[in-house]
């Protein structure tokens, strides 16, 4: 009995034409939604003039359907038992699952001003930039619609910059009609214990963003894992959103629509400072903002974002050190709402439910050459938005799963 099940599973989780895994892998049958909460700044003038704490008020959810497009350019390589593909990006607004429309306005940090002052630290360049910021009537903060903030707008200040810079700015610009990858993953034909594990990303085994082992591309993309998952395992996966590999550990047994699954969570240790967790030393890339690598809970991914000072954290700075959030008022971190988890069916290794939560922040520093940043007396890691990307196996699929997998085991 058990041997037969194992044999069937091993056959069906291989990523090749004709298997159950392959069909669902090419185009997920699960509806995936990405909810956004935008941090609306309540006191822009006080911050700019007096270097006050930034008072934010989250507004959301604004919901989009995502990852509904099938993988593209799927190519099997029998020589090394891999399959390569592109994951196309697409987002469709879901008004019925949102608190407002894409035309809703928000007061947010001026992305271009904050980024330009960081990318061009030369004092004379900053004098030049200052004249263009003033000429374009730009300020430290700006009012933008949801659509502009997420998917892009033409920035008036950047439109005047004589350097060859893109004048379009947006937290996820460009997104629609783009693709993530190329990913090359093991198809599991030679060894089922390697199925879905990433061999290369964009043609490389490393990211070139981090030093040492932090730069490695580890594990799968978290949509599935090799079968026969044990509770004692540390599940490694790579997330291009955060420009790094990370891991999840077992937390609890969960019953999902009659299917027994293991809930794996991203532990606080993964976000710890090198002082608390020496393994994280290579994720600390600079000494000043990180207070000599003692700060925790934020990840500087500027190297992955063309030098723009983007910092990734958990929503509301969950698991972050007090110094990170001391300049921001209005945050309420909550483990239940703001942590990331994966519900994995252990026999197949399939992720049947997940909630990926992350926050995108931008660093803004005082600049004595840029008028609108001149009065700042400290650095701010400014929360722009947080997102909750969720997917749950549909009722029909769950029924099929119960009958074909868990039912047979039990």
């Amino acid at each position: 009995g058990d041997m037969l099940i194992q044999k069937t599973i091993k056959k069906e989780v291989v990523l090749e034409e004709g298997t159950i895994a392959f069909k669902n892998w090419v185009k997920t049958g699960t509806e995936i939604y990405r909810q956004f909460w935008i941090f609306d700044v309540q006191n822009p003038q006080e911050v700019m003039m007096n270097s006050s704490n930034i008072q934010v008020k989250q507004r959301g959810p604004y919901t989009y359907r995502v990852r509904f497009l099938a993988k593209e350019n799927i190519t099997q390589d029998p020589k090394d038992n891999t399959v390569s593909f592109l994951q196309p990006n697409g987002a469709i607004f879901e008004p019925s699952l949102s608190v407002g429309t894409e035309a809703d306005n928000f007061t947010v940090l001026n992305l271009a001003v904050a980024a330009a002052s960081h990318i061009y630290p030369n004092p004379f360049v900053q004098v030049v930039l200052n004249s263009l910021i003033n000429k374009s009537k730009s300020s430290m903060f700006q009012v933008r619609t949801l659509r502009e903030l997420l998917w892009g707008y033409t920035d008036p200040f950047l439109s005047l910059v004589p350097y060859p810079v893109s004048t379009r700015v947006g937290m996820f610009y460009p997104y629609n009609n783009t693709a993530d990858g190329v990913y090359k993953v093991f198809n599991g034909k030679d060894s089922i214990s390697k199925v879905a594990i990433i061999d290369t990303y964009k043609g490389k085994r490393n990211l070139s963003y981090w030093e040492s082992y932090c730069d490695m591309i580890n594990g799968t993309d978290a949509a599935s894992f090799p079968p026969f998952v044990e509770k004692s395992q540390v599940l490694q996966f790579f997330s291009s959103d955060i420009c790094r590999s990370i891991y999840a550990v077992f937390e609890s047994d969960v019953n999902l629509k009659g299917i027994p699954v293991y809930r794996f969570v991203l532990p606080s240790k993964a976000f710890a400072s090198p002082v608390q967790n020496p393994d994280n030393h290579c994720f600390c890339t600079e000494k000043i903002i990180s207070k000599n690598c003692t700060s925790y809970g934020v990840l500087d991914i500027s190297k992955c974002k063309e030098g723009k000072p983007v910092y990734i954290s958990l929503p509301h700075f969950l698991y972050a050190s007090p110094d990170v959030s001391e300049t921001i008022d209005g945050l309420n971190p909550n483990e239940e709402e703001h942590r990331t988890y994966l519900d994995i069916e252990p026999i197949t290794g399939f992720t049947l439910q997940f909630a990926k939560r992350l926050q995108v922040n931008l660093l803004v520093k005082p600049s004595n050459k840029i008028q609108v940043l001149k009065r700042l007396k400290r650095n701010y890691i400014v929360p722009i938005l947080w997102l909750n990307e969720t997917g749950t196996i549909g009722d029909e699929k769950a029924k099929m799963f119960r009958s074909q997998v868990t039912g047979k085991i039990n």
């Epitope: 030369n122 004092p123 004379f124 360049v125 004098v127 200052n130 004249s131 003033n134 004589p162 004595n368």
Partner: antibody
Amino acid sequence: QVQLQQSGAELVMPGASVKMSCKASGYTFTDYWMHWVKQRPGQGLEWIGAIDTSDSYTSYNQKFKGKATLTVDESSSTAYMQLSSLTSEDSAVYYCARDYYGSSTAWFAYWGQGTLVTVSA
Amino acid sequence: ETTVTQSPASLSMAIGEKVTIRCITSTDIDDDMNWYQQKPGEPPKLLISEGNTLRPGVPSRFSSSGYGTDFVFTIDNMLSEDVADYYCLQSDNLPFTFGSGTKLEIK
């Protein structure tokens, strides 16, 4: 030590052009912008403009746009300024200057010795 | 463009006296004012940079103060070697602009 060596004095006809040089030594040339400053005899100083020596991006004082053209030659660590359609108003000493970036910025911390341009028929 | 008005145009002072030169700007430039000394036949020399910062190697008898639009440059005990032209420069915005200069002579 930082040195900016400028080319020698020029006597030029009205309507003609002149190109002067400023050779830098004692530092990495492409790490700093090069500024140019005009001083008419017995008069004050005027900022003409500056050039980013690493990518040749220029920033001009509007007053000198069309009059001055700034260029660089990275291989010889030399900055150039060409002045065109010369008139008697262009008779002056022209300086190249470089900043110093430390804990605070020192604008025009290093100067060349100046190039005297005399416009006369 | 920020206009810089420097006064006086010339100044005749006795050795050991206190010298005061003033620059007023047409716009608020915070503390982005610089002061230069120029002796005949030489390029200008930076004495004081933004934020009233005395440059290394410059004697402490030279100082400056001011913020916003009103700036003062001071020589506490004038020496004969201080005979020169003095210029202020605003570096807050482009184009950088100089004051018209002050000629300091010995009385």
